[in-house]
């Protein structure tokens, strides 16, 4: 009879791994090097155990692999001899969430490692400003998020609770709209959406600037600055200037920081190159006409922030035009 000292037992270790929907992940597992390596990755739910990936007798064995893992898993075969039993997992789905056990047997020991996989998603949210008849609304929207996020609103930096929440997707991922009626307000508003699992936060900030009164054929300068508190220097962002008219938004100019490209959709619109280099995206609109009256919206957006600045421009007839009438 051989001594059982040859067979050491290592208790089950547990690790929590967080992945993102649609992305790849590595479920880690290591063991003390030995010959006769057997590896079984299994998924455990309340009722059953499913074969995710197996390796023994020197090769991957997928005959009993559950179909949901087909072509989505692999081991680092050339590293097994060095004690690496980690599983490479492709194209994560929310259904992949749960408990995975990695059994490793060698000629000298057997160990079981437990990995808890959590899957999150946080597709960049956005803040929208909408006018419906005489009412004005701010909408914080996230198209795909999991788990359910924490959404908070602030008015002039004071937390508020009155918002209308809409959610779709019963099990996840969720699509969420949080709407705030800001009719008649000239306060600044901030909406924060937090995914606690991915430790990712997005903030949308809305500011209404004082109304600008201009005469016909004059020009107007509309301010819009990128606040360094919000944006880190290497962060990609985009700037969109648009005009709100009868509840419809039409784009006037568009800037992409990654390519430094600017597109103008209105020939009378321009911005100061010098200012732009200093992260000031203030706009000039020349040769004003009466029909230019309305709301102008500057949207600076990155993965983490959206800054909305609203300008109301009132263009009045010039004296000559008025006397002509």
């Amino acid at each position: 009879i051989f001594l059982s000292a040859f067979f050491t037992y290592v208790p089950m270790n547990e690790q929590i791994i967080i992945g993102r929907l649609g992305e790849d992940i590595i479920l880690p597992s290591s063991f003390e090097r030995g010959s006769e390596v057997v590896i079984h990755w299994k998924y455990q739910d309340s009722y059953n155990s499913y074969n995710v990936h197996s390796y023994y007798k020197g090769s991957g064995r997928l005959e009993s692999q559950d179909t949901r893992y087909a072509n989505r898993t692999s081991l680092f075969y050339n590293e097994i001899q060095n004690g690496n039993a980690s599983l490479f997992f492709r194209r994560l789905s929310l259904l992949d969430e749960g408990i995975y056990t990695c059994y490793v047997g060698t000629a000298i020991q057997a160990i079981t490692n437990k990995v808890v996989l959590k899957v999150g998603v946080f597709l960049t949210p956005m803040m929208k400003y909408e006018k419906r008849n005489t009412n004005s609304f701010l909408i914080c929207n996230v198209l795909s998020v999991y788990p359910r996020p924490i959404i908070t609103w602030k008015m002039d930096n004071t937390p508020i609770s009155e918002n209308n929440m809409q959610e779709t997707g019963s099990l996840g991922p969720f699509s969420i709209n949080s709407t705030l009626n800001i009719t008649g307000s000239n306060s600044s508003y901030e909406c924060t959406i937090e995914n606690s699992l991915l430790k990712q936060t997005w903030t949308g900030r809305w500011t209404m600037k004082d109304g600008l009164h201009k005469m016909q054929s004059e020009h107007v300068s509309l301010s819009c600055e990128l606040v360094n508190d919000y944006f880190s220097p290497n962060q990609d962002f985009k700037v969109t200037w648009s005009r709100m008219e009868s509840g419809i938004s039409s784009i006037l100019a568009y800037y992409l920081s990654s390519s430094q490209n600017t597109t103008f959709y209105e020939s009378r619109f321009s911005w100061n190159k010098e200012l732009k280099n200093q992260s000031d995206f203030s706009m000039n609109l020349t040769d004003l006409s009466l029909s230019d009256s309305g709301e102008y919206l500057c949207n600076i957006s990155s993965d983490e922030y959206t800054l909305l600045t609203i300008h109301t421009v009132h263009v009045e007839p010039s004296q000559e035009t008025a006397s002509d009438n």
Partner: antibody
Amino acid sequence: QVQLVESGGGVVQPGRSLRLSCAASGFTFSDYGIHWVRQAPGKGLEWVAVIWYDGSDKYYADSVRGRFTISRDNSKNTLSLQMNSLRVEDTAVYYCARDRSSGAMGYFVYWGQGTLVTVSS
Amino acid sequence: DIQMTQSPSTLSASVGDRVTITCRASQSISSWLAWYQQKPGKAPKLLIYKASSLESGVPSRFSGSGSGTEFTLTISSLQPDDLATYYCQQYNSYSYTFGQGTKLEIK
């Protein structure tokens, strides 16, 4: 010290059933696959069945498939072999034997002392 | 099933002799072969796995070699304690199969 102790053998008539047990100690039972191997009197060894460490996979020799069922209770460190529709040619000493690891390797590192099953009318 | 054929069926040798037992598989089994020793009235005991790896605690006079279909078990210097029947076993695929055994007698 690794120990495997078989029990449940005896004399049984053809067509009847018998249940063999194997009690394991000296190792973490739930980490290892266990096999049944038999040996007819004066004859060679014949592999019968295997059950993997977690009970998820079971494989049988053609000669017993459909008649024998292997099972395990990891909470009690026991292995069973339910033998139905027994035939005279099933007469043998039945050994339970521990796999190198999960049950996937397929060779036998530790053996019990065996229990004799005699199928006779 | 893969057939395993051992030769010779019986072998008589003297203490100190070098003894070789051969095992042939009906198809390639790579190196997935084990050798066991069974003494009268006892359970088998693992000697060699993966064709040539010596199991822990087994005397170094035992060695194995071969791959594919041809394998050998060698006892470099026969000892009285080696009186037993020796079996090869393939574990390349289910069902696992044994050779018919080689009975080793001491002259």
